[in-house]
């Protein structure tokens, strides 16, 4: 059984998932058909830049030139219109900048409404910009193979856009997927482009295809579901995670803890703290503070994000995961450097987590 003292912190708000995309309105670049367009990726300290259009990776071709932080489109056509993004990958994090490209003969004046805030929709479904379906968030779709323990809930997502707004339907093994095809049926969240199956059983194994369509086109995406029989064991944590990290004062840092657990896991992020100048309580046990834990109000508990760090944030961070069978924990160290000192690659420190057991 774990034994430690917890410092109460009732003011702790549940962490929001880190925002990895810009929060201001996307810039719109307008070009007439046949014109050339050049856009500069407005991100700082970009070591590696990757580009996407409508969520799909964009590579160079005979009309698209990618040079450093610049994207050039030669002889633009209406098909080049869409939501573009450049992502800068850095050592500590990655950041994405979005912008719109509109290749059209007529320069649209936008809504007639007196919107003085300048906030326009990314895509105005009521406008005349008719558009075939497209994926809006391919990150949510990258994991095609889902191996899920029996009795768990499975969710497949196909976030899409288009004008008019497309409809979504689901196929199982290439055929229409009907409610009566599985005991307990399934749920569809059209507003989140998702299919949800609760309490899966081996007969749910198969290929699930979302078909998203409107009058201008159709796209589809297939997931493979494998349902594995339960084999109870305590949580398994991926070796090497969380990894040691270093950042400067005022910087941001993320610790990741990859968990495999057949039974429902409970994740806690814990840090040693001092109380009344002491690291240990009267019972000789260390003071520990739960920074984040899985639950209704906490999304993505496997990630602990620290923003605007101070020297006081330095120290050991423990990822503790438990289920009804047992528990496991691994830890990493955060080094906070003064502003003038650039963070380098941290030498691996092997931390023994035994004291938590």
């Amino acid at each position: 059984r774990p034994s430690f003292s917890l410092v109460e912190d009732t003011t702790l708000e549940p962490e929001e998932p880190p925002t990895k995309y810009q929060i201001s309105q996307p810039e719109v670049y307008v070009a007439a058909p046949g014109e050339s367009l050049e856009v500069r990726c407005l991100l700082k300290d970009a070591a590696v830049i990757s580009w996407t259009k409508d969520g799909v990776h964009l590579g160079p071709n005979n009309r698209t030139v990618l040079i450093g932080e610049y994207l050039q489109i030669k002889g633009a056509t209406p098909r080049d219109s869409g939501l573009y993004a450049c992502t800068a990958s850095r050592t500590v994090d990655s950041e994405t900048w979005y912008f719109m490209v509109n290749v059209t003969d007529a320069i649209s004046s936008g809504d007639d409404e007196d919107d003085t805030d300048g906030a326009e929709d990314f895509v105005s479904e009521n406008s005349n910009n008719k558009r075939a379906p497209y994926w809006t968030n391919t990150e949510k779709m990258e994991k095609r193979l889902h191996a899920v323990p029996a009795a768990n809930t499975v969710k497949f997502r196909c976030p899409a856009g288009g004008n008019p707004m497309p409809t979504m339907r689901w196929l199982k093994n290439g055929k229409e997927f009907k409610q009566e095809h599985r005991i307990g049926g399934y749920k569809v969240r059209n507003q989140h482009w998702s299919l949800i199956m609760e309490s899966v059983v081996p007969s749910d194994k198969g290929n699930y295809t979302c078909v998203v369509e409107n009058e201008y086109g159709s796209i589809n995406h297939t997931y493979h579901l494998d349902v594995v029989e339960r084999s109870p064991h305590r949580p398994i944590l991926q070796a090497g995670l969380p990894a040691n990290a270093s950042t400067v004062v005022g910087g941001d840092v993320e610790f990741v803890c990859k968990v495999y657990s057949d039974a429902q896991p409970h994740i806690q992020w814990i840090k040693h703290v001092e109380k009344n100048g002491s690291k240990y309580g009267p019972d000789g046990l260390p003071y520990l503070k739960v920074l984040k834990h899985s639950g209704i109000n906490s999304s993505n508990a496997e990630v602990l994000a620290l923003f605007n760090v101070t020297e006081a944030d330095a120290g050991e961070y423990i990822c503790k995961v438990s289920n009804y069978i047992g528990q496991a924990n691994q830890s990493a160290w955060l080094t906070v450097l003064p502003k003038q000192q650039a963070p380098g690659r941290e030498k691996e420190i092997t931390a023994s987590p035994d004291y938590l057991e």
């Epitope: 925002t19 929060i23 895509v123 968030n137 507003q191």
Partner: antibody
Framework: EVQLVESGGGLVKPGGSLRLSCAAS????????LSWVRQAPGKGLEWVGR??????????DYAAPVRGRFTISRDDSKNTLYLQMNSLKTEDTAVYYC??????????????WGQGTLVTVSS | SYELTQPLSVSVALGQTARITCSGD??????VDWYQQKPGQAPVLVIY???DRPSGIPERFSGSNSGNTATLTISRAQAGDEADYYC?????????FGGGTKLTVLG
């Protein structure tokens, strides 16, 4: 504290326009879909429309009675949601609430509500 | 258009169990959420995704949804539970609310 605060309500003549604002605080505004819900005096709740988060495309959906007359927009840099109401009718008289989805992408339930702002359409 | 039907009113004796129904065509294939609204106040989410409770909502509140009917169950009813209750689901990309049920706690 997670909070939504509506403003901009008031008395307006039929055919007129009004713009409501909803200021958010205490959460990462840009991550969430947001809706407007209204409630006529002594009546039930009626959904007006919603706007998705930027990462979900930032697109909007509207209820049939307001489609073409109302426009929902958001300014993530100001943590503010807007409802532009044009061609107002007497039946648009209601308390207007802004509401936030329970989680950024997994739930459609409205977990956070503002206190509401009253819009009265009368000649 | 899709409709959710609720009884106008439901009465329950103090300490007893109240059940409020919400019916709609093939409602079991959609998730249903429930809201409590007291006079002069904004609605409060009490059940989401058919049967999940937000933090701070007592265990006395529970939900179920299958076939064409969703049910909100309030066990050991208290005077403070007296309020209007609304079910909510979706019709494609539109939110749909039930007409609301006034719960009266007797005694």
């Amino acid at each position: 504290e997670v909070q939504l605060v509506e403003s901009g309500g008031g008395l307006v003549k039929p055919g007129g326009s009004l713009r409501l604002s909803c200021a958010a605080s205490g959460f990462t505004f840009s991550s969430y879909a947001l809706s407007w819900v209204r409630q006529a005096p002594g009546k039930g709740l009626e959904w007006v429309g919603r706007i998705r988060s930027r990462i979900e495309g930032g697109t909007t959906d509207y209820a049939a009675p307001v489609r073409g007359r109302f426009t929902i927009s958001r300014d993530d840099s100001k943590n503010t949601l807007y409802l532009q109401m044009n061609s107002l009718k007497t039946e648009d008289t209601a308390v207007y609430y802004c509401a936030r989805d329970r989680s950024p992408s997994d739930s459609s339930a409205f977990a956070i509500w503002g206190q509401g702002t009253l819009v009265t359409v009368s000649s | 258009s899709y409709e959710l039907t609720q009884p106008l009113s439901v009465s329950v004796a103090l300490g007893q169990t109240a059940r409020i129904t919400c019916s709609g065509d093939n409602l079991g294939s959609q998730y249903v959420d429930w809201y409590q609204q007291k006079p002069g106040q904004a609605p409060v989410l009490v059940i989401y995704d058919d049967n999940d409770r937000p933090s701070g909502i007592p265990e006395r509140f529970s939900g179920s949804n299958s076939g064409n009917t969703a049910t909100l169950t309030i066990s050991r009813a208290q005077a403070g539970d007296e309020a209007d209750y609304y079910c909510q689901s979706w019709d494609s990309l539109s939110v749909v609310f039930g007409g609301g049920t006034k719960l009266t706690v007797l005694g």
